[in-house]
């Protein structure tokens, strides 16, 4: 098993300054590591480009909501 302590950490140092259409977004992941200077969201676009965004911005929160709801299944 690889040593998780030595696993590389992805950080965002700058955020996009333009709003991205949700139609262009495929997924997101949160950067929550204390080793990173900023709390961040990394969006992956439908063409597999990764973009750092500020989770404090409303459009970023709305985009995460939109992507979350796309994962909803009527199992529960």
């Amino acid at each position: 098993q690889p040593d998780a302590i030595n696993a590389p950490v992805t950080c965002c140092y700058n955020f996009t300054n333009r709003k991205i259409s949700v139609q262009r977004l495929a997924s997101y992941r949160r950067i929550t590591s204390s080793k990173c200077p900023k709390e961040a969201v990394i969006f992956k676009t439908i063409v597999a480009k990764e973009i750092c965004a500020d989770p404090k911005q409303k459009w970023v929160q709305d985009s995460m909501d939109h992507l979350d709801k796309q994962t909803q299944t009527p199992k529960t």
């Epitope: 997924s27 997101y28 992941r29 949160r30 929550t32 709390e39 969201v41 989770p55 404090k56 970023v60 929160q61 709305d62 995460m64 909501d65 992507l67 979350d68 709801k69 994962t71 909803q72 299944t73 199992k75 529960t76």
Partner: nanobody, 123 residues
Framework: EVQLVESGGGLVQAGGSLRLSCAAS????????MGWFRQAPEKEREFVAV????????FYSNSVKGRFTISRDNAKNTVYLQMNSLKPEDTAVYYC????????????????WGQGTQVTVSS
């Protein structure tokens, strides 16, 4: 890091009501999807309800739909679970969770968890 503290649990008779609260501190509360889960003795942790960051959408497990209501107040960094028409089978420890990763009702997509509050419904 997000810290979550639940309150409002207790002992109630069947048919009664309780309102659970979960106060968050730390990082930006409005940037997290919030959920409630529960765990009864000898059972696995079970999804109860989820609310989006904006509060505009909610989703419930079939077992609580129509009886429980999840809501949030981003100005107060708090999420609530109003529980009405309680049944003995609702007895469990109720956990509040903050969802950082993409998902909906899956526990694995929630990064931060409270310590839980006990709800006991007597018949």
């Amino acid at each position: 890091e997000v810290q979550l503290v639940e309150s409002g649990g207790g002992l109630v008779q069947a048919g009664g009501s309780l309102r659970l609260s979960c106060a968050a501190s730390g990082r930006t509360f409005s940037s997290y999807r919030m959920g409630w889960f529960r765990q009864a003795p000898e059972k696995e942790r079970e999804f109860v309800a989820v609310i989006t960051r904006s509060g505009g959408s909610t989703f419930y497990s079939n077992s609580v739909k129509g009886r429980f209501t999840i809501s949030r107040d981003n100005a107060k960094n708090t999420v609530y679970l109003q529980m009405n028409s309680l049944k003995p089978e609702d007895t469990a420890v109720y956990y509040c969770a903050a969802g950082a990763q993409m998902g909906w009702a899956e526990a694995s997509t929630y990064d931060y968890w409270g310590q839980g509050t006990q709800v006991t419904v007597s018949s």
